[in-house]
């Protein structure tokens, strides 16, 4: 007999064709011989089956000898053998209805697990293969699990259910809730205004939660909370902010913070956490601030950086348009008795300048 696979919630059309290309009497029954529907002349008649309100046919096709059974809003329990009786013949169609659902919610935090559960009719033995948006294939039976979801897992998952050499495809949209970047670094000269941005990697109609920025200054022994805020319907409202530094926060997404000026005592690392309503766990983004200061004290020209710099970064002091006088993989460099002119302090990574501060050395008479 013919096998047809259907998807829970969808509509399926089971075909039944007579040899005569005209409207004749037909009946559709289930395996218990309960009439589902049929015709009486040009009228559609329905039987006492549980499909009553979800079953239909296409009257426009009857004149061509086609008598389909249409079942709307499919349920797993609609899986059955359906019998079409026409012209003293019986056509049997086995319908197998499958459903594929995400374990809890299709909006999951980065690092959480995604479990896809297959609902299938008794007696079936389907196999499932899913392809993630980044092209990763996973296979399984009744359940498929993906641990440690990553940002690239956001998007449409395409899952194929295979049964009796037939296949049915499911598409599930998964949203991984995360910040666009796990970490960022800001390089600033002393006194400059600092802007931190925390763009989210997803968009939702309403976004509600609360967040906090904890800061570990390089010079401090412990971290402290710089700001706490609420997020309601995408509007940000500050709950509490430290007096030093006096941060400003934007009232709209993406989350945005402004530090009035970069000072050595603020250099360090921060961790912004965002707890979303009805979600367990938090979103995290690390932010780092590196501050540079160039000073001249008597006969000593010094350049210093504070904050989380990698060991491969180079700190240099050079007179404008000349070779570097001093270059070290350290956080402070100096030149004794510098010549007069415009000196540049440069923080660079493999030749790329990350931060530059200029200081004018006046001639000594």
């Amino acid at each position: 007999k013919k096998v047809v696979l259907g998807k829970k919630g969808d509509t399926v059309e089971l075909t039944c064709t007579a040899s005569q290309k005209k409207s004749i009497q037909f009946h559709w029954k289930n395996s218990n011989q309960i009439k589902i529907l049929g015709n009486q002349g040009s009228f559609l008649t329905k039987g006492p089956s549980k499909l009553n309100d979800r079953a239909d046919s296409r009257r426009s096709l009857w004149d061509q000898g086609n008598f389909p059974l249409i079942i709307k809003n499919l349920k797993i329990e609609d899986s059955d053998t359906y019998i079409c009786e026409v012209e003293d013949q019986k056509e049997e169609v086995q319908l197998l209805v499958f459903g594929l659902t995400a374990n809890s919610d299709t909006h999951l935090l980065q690092g959480q697990s995604l479990t896809l559960t297959l609902e299938s009719p008794p007696g079936s033995s389907p196999s499932v293969q899913c392809r993630s948006p980044r092209g990763k294939n996973i296979q399984g039976g009744k359940t498929l699990s993906v641990s440690q979801l990553e940002l690239q897992d956001s998007g449409t998952w395409t899952c194929t259910v295979l049964q009796n050499q037939k296949k049915v495809e499911f598409k599930i949209d998964i949203v991984v809730l995360a910040f666009q970047k796990a970490s960022s670094i800001v390089y600033k000269k002393e006194g400059e205004q600092v802007e931190f941005s925390f763009p989210l990697a997803f968009t939702v109609e309403k976004l509600t939660g609360s967040g906090e920025l904890w800061w570990q200054a390089e010079r401090a022994s412990s971290s402290k909370s710089w700001i706490t805020f609420d997020l309601k319907n995408k509007e940000v409202s500050v709950k509490r902010v430290t007096q030093d530094p006096k941060l400003q926060m934007g009232k709209k997404l993406p989350l945005h913070l402004t530090l009035p000026q970069a000072l050595p005592q603020y250099a360090g690392s921060g961790n912004l956490t965002l707890a979303l309503e009805a979600k367990t766990g938090k979103l995290h983004q690390e932010v780092n601030l590196v501050v540079m200061r160039a000073t001249q004290l008597q006969k000593n020209l010094t350049c210093e950086v504070w904050g989380p710099t990698s060991p491969k970064l180079m700190l240099s002091l050079k007179l404008e348009n000349k070779e570097a006088k001093v270059s070290k993989r350290e956080k402070a460099v100096w030149v004794l008795n510098p010549e007069a002119g415009m000196w540049q302090c440069l923080l660079s990574d493999s030749g790329q300048v990350l931060l530059e501060s200029n200081i004018k050395v006046l001639p000594t008479w």
Partner: antibody
Amino acid sequence: EVQLLESGGGLVQPGGSLRLSCAASGFTFSTYAMSWVRQAPGKGLEWVSTISDNIGNTYYADSVKGRFTISRDNSKNTLYLQMNSLRAEDTAVYYCTKDNEDYYMDVWGKGTTVTVSS
Amino acid sequence: AIQMTQSPSSLSASVGDRVTITCRASQGIRNDLGWCQQKPGKAPKFLIYAASTLQSGVPSRFSGSGYGTDFTLTISSLQPEDFATYYCLQDYNYPRTFGQGTKVEIK
């Protein structure tokens, strides 16, 4: 058509109170933040207060904090500004404004005049 | 509070002229800036939001640009109905603050 109509302005003595109303129509009132902005005679625009959508967070300018109260009745599509302990410097035309989805004041009423004088 | 400084405070121009008004914020406000127009005795009319997005119904001769602290409103070809006072407004955070206004007069 989106419309905002202010009412309740008038002459009041220093120390007195006044309640301004703003009747809104032409949009789903409960889903938008609403604000009051004022303009003293011959001067520029000054933001007074904002109330967010159905959550009801409220924000005030320092110059009116503790004296003015913004509120809304979503069932009546009406925004209010209760003004107490009025001062001469509160004399202004008060405009009711609607925020758009991006929280910008995109629609303004015609204004109602408040005069604080003895 | 964030201070908004508009310049010039007034300017004289002729119909057809290209007019530029600038607005500077005392701190970075991303592109959270709007522009509105006010004619004498009338309520302000909203022109531009998010620094460069034109409010529906606003003629395309109006344009906005800028990010961070420096913003510009440009009227490419001044029309008789454009003589008015223009205000910038920071919408980065509370308190919302306006520039002091720029009056565009007929030369």
